[in-house]
Interface confidence: low
């Protein structure tokens, strides 16, 4: 026979000759950091025919590393399942929990021995200092000195010293969330009043009012032969500014036809609609009233006006 | 290697309703929020909302509010989208995307959603 | 909302070439913890999208040291040293101060 087979956990003890005679065995032995167990054969013969009789390192398997218990509150995965040496050891802490330490060991062979990269890690309880104070308002557990992961508080305004109303400007509720950080900033509390909204040939058709706060929201539509320019529907933001800002009405220009269309209703609320002026034939107007999708309203190719060109 | 596969292309009708989901593995899937994300053709990112599967807790983009509603399964790891009363405005690809904090560091493949009559 | 703006819609770059693209708040995005909530994402062409910067200037994993992030509260950069053709692609920014979370509209990175 040629020389012996060779294998990736095992090795021949002794040094390989050019050929054996039939009959004569080799033996072999598990490699550094591997170790055999029985009851497979770790030999083989030559034989008759100049072959080697099956053999395999199915017998030798790779040193493991310790058994790792998983951290309190967290667990210990070991990569692809197993302990072996030149694996990985990946630590994972439960939510509301973070890792003090290695997130990864690795098992490693020190002489013959398999032994971990280092210590395990533990996993500690996510705590957040008290949330931001605001100025004209408050959160609530203000006395609590320490919060848990996902312990939420919730901020409200004082009541204003005159005749507005503070408004809380933001999401009232965060909560602790992960690495110690609260989940967004606080919100603020202050006063915010938006002027009284005047469309000149128009008219208010929802959110009627005094006085329009935070979040007030007021719609609009224009009186017959006028068109908005601007949006139907604005909303007093955190600048006690209207955004969008307040529509203008404008007038319809009529069509230079001698027939002029009998307007059956106003042209309004950010309408899709054309004006008569641009579905007309004729001298055109600078201006196009503005296309949106209002829902309600016609898409453009489907004009209420266009029947009457 | 963390993955989010998310189901198959839709092709629904005006009005009716279809639920997406995006399958988590090889993390724990309650340790983060899953986010979900539309992109129409040619267009940006817009983000509609999170949801927290250990809590249920999910957030929405007031855009979207009354037109999707997620969920989340944790026994099969799997977050789910629903959109109702589709128009051809939804038509989209829809992305899952794993983070907590706005670190979306894993992302589904995409959906695409075509409304059509 | 928070209004996030990329000016520029595309940068058209020669390979090996350092770029910077930029991103405004409409907000500031730094909490009082210290942290900035930005994070930048890149989508490559037909690809989903891909985060490689969070809190504004740490590199996420896997990505390259090409890339970084740097900024004040509302003005923010992405910069990418020796540009490479894997590189092309839509840069969106992302902030995450509050809800909703809103992105730029993109910067699409073109290779001369």
């Known amino acids: 026979c040629e020389e012996p087979p060779t294998f990736e956990a095992m090795e021949l003890i002794g040094k390989p000759k050019p050929y054996y005679e039939i009959g004569e065995r080799v033996d072999y032995k598990c490699k550094k950091g591997y170790f055999y167990i029985p009851p497979l054969a770790t030999h083989t013969i030559c034989d008759r025919n100049h072959t080697w009789l099956p053999v395999s390192d199915d017998a030798c398997y790779r040193e493991t590393c310790p058994y790792i218990r998983d951290p309190l509150n967290g667990q210990a995965v070991p990569a692809n399942g197993t302990y072996e040496f030149g694996y990985q050891m990946h630590f994972i802490c439960n939510e509301g929990y973070y890792l003090i330490g290695e997130e990864i060991l690795y098992c490693e062979l020190k002489g013959s021995v398999a032994i971990w990269s280092g210590k395990p890690p533990i996993c500690e309880k996510v705590l957040c200092t008290p949330p931001p104070k605001i100025k004209n308002g408050k959160h609530t557990f203000s006395e609590v000195e320490v919060f848990e992961y996902l312990d939420a508080v919730t901020y409200s305004c004082d009541p204003a010293p005159g005749p507005d109303p503070f408004s809380l400007i933001g999401e009232s509720t965060i909560y602790c969330g992960d690495n110690s950080v609260w989940s967004r900033a606080a919100p603020e509390c202050k006063v915010v009043k938006c002027r009284f909204p005047v469309v000149e040939n128009g008219k208010q058709i929802s959110g009627f009012g005094k006085k329009f706060y935070y979040k007030a929201t007021v719609m609009f539509e224009c009186d017959k032969g006028f068109y908005l320019d601007g949006s139907d529907t604005i909303v007093c933001d955190s600048n006690s500014t209207w955004d969008p800002p307040v529509p203008k009405c404008l007038k319809v220009l009529p069509p230079s036809s001698t027939k002029p269309p009998a307007l059956s209703h106003s042209v309004s609320t950010s309408s899709t609609t054309k004006s008569p002026a641009s579905s007309a034939s004729g001298p055109r107007p600078t201006y196009k009233p503005p296309v949106s999708n209002y829902p309600g309203y016609p898409k453009p190719e489907e004009g209420i006006l266009d029947s009457l060109d | 290697q963390v993955q989010l596969q998310q189901s198959g292309a839709e092709l629904a009708r005006p009005g009716a309703s279809v639920k997406l989901s995006c399958k988590a593995s090889?993390?724990?899937?309650?340790?983060?929020?899953i986010s979900w994300v539309k992109q129409r053709t040619g267009q940006g990112l817009e983000w509609i909302g999170e949801?927290?599967?250990?809590?249920?807790?999910?957030y929405y983009n007031e855009k979207f509010k009354g037109k999707a509603t997620l969920t989340a399964d944790k026994s099969s790891s799997t977050a789910y989208m629903e959109l109702r009363s589709l128009t051809s405005e939804d038509s989209a690809v829809y992305f899952c995307?794993?983070?907590?904090?706005?670190?979306?560091?894993?992302w589904g493949q995409g959906t695409s959603v075509i409304v059509s009559s | 909302d928070i209004v996030m703006t990329q000016a520029a819609p595309s940068v058209p770059v020669t390979p090996g070439e350092s770029v910077s693209i930029s991103c405004r708040s409409s907000?500031?995005?730094?909490?009082?913890?210290?942290?900035?909530?930005l994070y930048w994402f890149l989508q490559r062409p037909g690809q989903s999208p891909q985060l490689l910067i969070y809190?504004?200037?740490n590199l996420a994993s896997g990505v390259p040291d090409r890339f970084s992030g740097s900024g004040s509260g509302t003005t923010f950069t992405l910069r990418i040293s020796g540009v490479e053709a894997e590189d092309v692609g839509v840069y969106y920014c992302?902030?995450?101060?509050?809800?909703?979370?809103?992105f730029g509209g993109g910067t699409k990175l073109e290779i001369k």
């Open positions: 949801i927290f599967p250990r809590s249920g807790n999910t």
């Open positions: 992302m902030q995450h101060l509050e809800y909703p979370c809103t």
């Open positions: 809190r504004m200037s």
């Open positions: 907000k500031s995005l730094l909490h009082s913890n210290g942290n900035t909530y």
């Open positions: 090889d993390y724990t899937f309650t340790s983060y929020g």
């Open positions: 995307a794993r983070g907590l904090g706005g670190a979306m560091d894993y």
